[in-house]
Interface confidence: low
């Protein structure tokens, strides 16, 4: 017997559906109506036939009362080929829900997204996460998707993007966006970062994550941030193969004074990189290849420095007379 595609936990909190049959019984998903967290994985299916069975242009207001009654706050949709028209139809209906966090992963969006009708209401998300989502529209996908969202988005995560650079002139500002995560885009690089950080479109960013994005030097990242006018409080550059030295002919880049936390862990560093901010509250240099303790003049003025997992430290022990510099936690490097 084939297992049930959908499983709802005992608390009616989390519901996970895995539709792997070639012609799944989508009605099974109705058991998720009472769940707060819903995950739907479509097994790589092409959802084009769905368009024949639903009226994507129907007025979504007719479903408003039903949708408002749903408990879902977090929705994940994955592993499917989705016509843009169907995605838009879903977003229009979900606009009447209490959905706050939407995750799209392993999706191929085909066709172009129509413009938002005047009478339509946007989806009031606080968090949007995309992983390995490809769009037929290339660089304009963010602008097209953005028009279906209300401007209160606080968290945007884009991983394994096929086009991590955006068509900046089409993108509107994200006035409430405080966290931007572009991690796991290894082809991005510093120039790509410049293209992705559309100037003046991300005025409120406080947390910027750039793990595994092909960054080369902190100075290069500093330049890209300065060019875009982005001033994060926290910057994560971990899991990049960073160079410690700066091109001697390259001028110093002035870091924003707003930056107080910098993560340089798992960066393959054999010495503390040049060109760091002069003053930081938090600096994470754990799990690098530092063969000796950094000299004070190699470091920024820093309140909380993490050095665990470097060769010069015997795991689990602090430096003599410098115990306060280490968290004492032994990471698995």
């Amino acid at each position: 017997t084939t297992p049930e595609p959908c499983e709802l936990d005992d608390e009616d909190f989390r519901c996970v559906c895995n539709f792997s049959e070639p012609q799944p019984d989508w009605s099974e998903a109705f058991q998720c109506v009472s769940a707060v967290e819903v995950e739907i994985h479509a097994g790589g299916l092409n959802l084009e036939p769905f368009l024949k069975r639903v009226d994507a242009d129907a007025d979504p207001r007719q479903y408003a009362d039903t949708v408002k009654a749903l408990r879902v706050r977090r929705l994940t949709v994955g592993a499917a080929q989705v016509p843009a028209q169907l995605l838009v139809g879903a977003l229009r209906v979900l606009a009447y829900s209490r959905l706050k966090e939407l995750t799209l992963e392993d999706l191929k969006i085909t066709g172009t997204m129509p413009p938002l009708p005047l009478e339509a209401t946007g989806l009031a998300l606080s968090s949007l996460r995309l992983r390995n989502v490809s769009w037929a529209t290339g660089r304009s996908w963010l602008a097209e998707l953005q028009q279906w969202l209300k401007p209160g988005l606080k968290v945007l995560s884009i991983a394994q993007a096929h086009s991590p650079a955006f068509s900046c002139e089409q993108v509107r500002a994200f006035p409430a966006l405080t966290s931007l995560d572009l991690s796991d885009n290894p082809g991005l690089g510093e120039r790509g970062l410049m293209a992705a950080l559309c100037p003046h479109k991300f005025p409120a960013i406080q947390n910027l994550a750039l793990r595994n994005t092909g960054m080369e030097t902190p100075t290069g990242v500093c330049a890209a941030l300065a060019a875009a006018g982005v001033q994060p409080h926290s910057l994560d550059l971990s899991h990049n193969s960073l160079r410690a030295t700066v091109n001697p002919s390259a001028p110093r880049c002035m870091w924003s004074s707003a930056l107080n936390s910098l993560n340089l862990s798992f960066a393959g560093l054999e010495q503390v990189p040049k060109g760091l901010p002069a003053k930081l509250r938090v600096l994470d240099l754990s799990c690098n290849r530092l063969n000796r303790a950094p000299q004070p003049d190699e470091l920024p003025e820093v309140d909380n420095l993490t050095l665990d997992g470097n060769p010069f430290l015997v795991p689990g022990t602090a430096l003599p007379h410098e115990g306060s510099m280490n968290s004492g936690v032994v990471p698995a490097c």
Epitope: G138, R139, A165, S167, E190, R191, M194, A195, P199, C222, A223, A224, A226, A227, A250, P251, R252, C253, M254
Partner: nanobody
Framework: QVQLQESGGGSVQTGESLRLSCVAS????????MGWYRQTLGDQREMVAT???????RYADAVKGRFTISRDNAKSAVYLQMNSLNREDTAVYYC????????????????WGQGTQVTVSS
């Protein structure tokens, strides 16, 4: 200091072709959008074509299908291949680039070339 050096302008007959080149030099870190604009006497400068770092091009309606913009990121250069030229294409052509450059610190701003004259006569 950053400079944009244009070349390739000149006088041609209607229906002929020209290729304009523009190279950015100086303390350049990276170059964002690049483009070509033109201006006739007494008129506003108008966009002819622009191209972003990824190679996505935009054209003015008047030149679509006749002009092709391209760039070489390694050389910080932009080119404009102009085919089927007509008298309305007569103008001074200006190169434009959005450049992250190095002075005392990093800066990013638009730079303009000095312009190169293109004259099309019948």
């Amino acid at each position: 200091q950053v400079q944009l050096q244009e070349s390739g302008g000149g006088s041609v007959q209607t229906g002929e072709s020209l290729r304009l080149s523009c190279v950015a030099s100086g303390n350049i870190r990276s170059v964002g959008d690049m483009g070509w604009y033109r201006q006739t006497l007494g008129d506003q400068r108008e966009m002819v074509a622009t191209i972003d770092y990824g190679g996505v091009a935009r054209y003015a309606d008047a030149v679509k299908g006749r002009f092709t913009i391209s760039r070489d990121n390694a050389k910080s250069a932009v080119y404009l291949q102009m085919n089927s030229l007509n008298r309305e294409d007569t103008a001074v052509y200006y190169c434009n680039a959005d450049i992250l450059y190095k002075s005392d610190s990093y800066a990013r701003r638009e730079f303009w070339g000095q312009g190169t004259q293109v004259t099309v006569s019948s």
